[in-house]
């Protein structure tokens, strides 16, 4: 299933995560995912 | 499931040491941030400190009140964090919990283990 | 360091009550997207366990009934229908700098 509205994919991590965390963490692979 | 287990709590006397460990299980140690949190008897949470990752250099914050006598330290080949606690204070008595998170919300929490200062 | 305000410090509610918790931040803990707030639950005895983080993202396995909402400097959250195992300590903590800090906890208890 798709990611829900606000988080992506990531495949280092293998589930969905919150693309807020990208605040911090601007460098996680799934942050590309995010709007 | 994710599992963390600390260890290492116990009664030290004013000015002693202690180092606590947690031991962590079922998620992706290396890549998470590790802190340890402390509740005092019948109080509210405290953070106490944080570690970041082997990629942050193991980047470490502590709050005032314990900044320059405890250490936050990790391993991850052994999937373990520690803090070591110096110079020891009446008031650092708590139950101190290691928790593991992304960033910001602190998604898993161990059992916690009891520290008690006193002569 | 941004100070955490939470009240009430403890309320009576029965079974099936609608129960409101507020947090309030010295300041803002959001940016145009995100807040950066998150609400946790702590049984006596026990560990406190993630029910929302960012200011309303349910955390998995949390029952429906609790939410979150809020921005800039206010935040709740809320028990639409209070369930007996629903009665604990509630904090809030926010994650914008560091230190990270808690407000002070709200007793929820059996009228």
């Known amino acids: 299933a798709p990611c829900s509205r606000g988080s992506s994919w990531s495949a280092d991590l293998a589930k969905c995560m919150d693309c807020a965390s990208c605040r911090a963490r601007p460098h996680s692979d799934f942050c590309l995912g995010c709007a | 499931q994710v599992e963390l287990v600390e260890s290492g709590g116990g009664l030290v006397q004013p000015g002693g040491s202690l180092r606590l460990s947690c031991a962590a299980s079922g998620f992706t140690f290396s890549s998470y941030w590790m802190s340890w949190v402390r509740q005092a008897p019948g109080k509210g949470l405290e953070w106490v400190a944080e570690?970041?990752?082997?990629?942050?250099?193991?980047?470490?914050h502590y709050a005032e009140s314990v900044k320059g006598r405890f250490t936050i330290s990790r391993d991850d080949s052994k999937n373990s964090l520690y803090l070591q606690m110096n110079s020891l204070r009446a008031e650092d008595t708590a139950v101190y919990y290691c928790?593991?998170?992304?960033?910001?919300?602190?998604?898993?929490w161990g059992q916690g283990t009891l520290v008690t200062v006193s002569s | 360091d941004i100070q955490m305000t939470q009240s009430p410090s403890s309320l009576s509610a029965s079974v099936g009550d609608r129960v409101t918790i507020t947090c309030r931040a010295s300041?803002?803990?959001?940016?145009?997207?995100?807040?950066?707030m998150h609400w946790y639950q702590q049984k006596p005895g026990k560990a406190p366990k993630l029910l929302i983080k960012?200011?309303?993202n349910l955390e998995s396995g949390v029952p429906s009934r609790f939410s979150g909402s809020g921005s800039g400097t206010d935040f709740t959250l809320t028990i639409s229908s209070l369930q007996p195992e629903d009665f604990a300590t509630y904090y809030c903590q926010h994650s914008w700098e560091i230190p990270y800090t808690f407000g002070g906890g709200t007793k929820v208890e059996i009228k």
């Open positions: 960012y200011a309303s």
């Open positions: 570690i970041r990752l082997k990629s942050d250099n193991y980047a470490t």
């Open positions: 928790t593991g998170y992304y960033a910001d919300a602190m998604d898993y």
């Open positions: 300041q803002s803990v959001s940016t145009s997207s995100y807040s950066y």
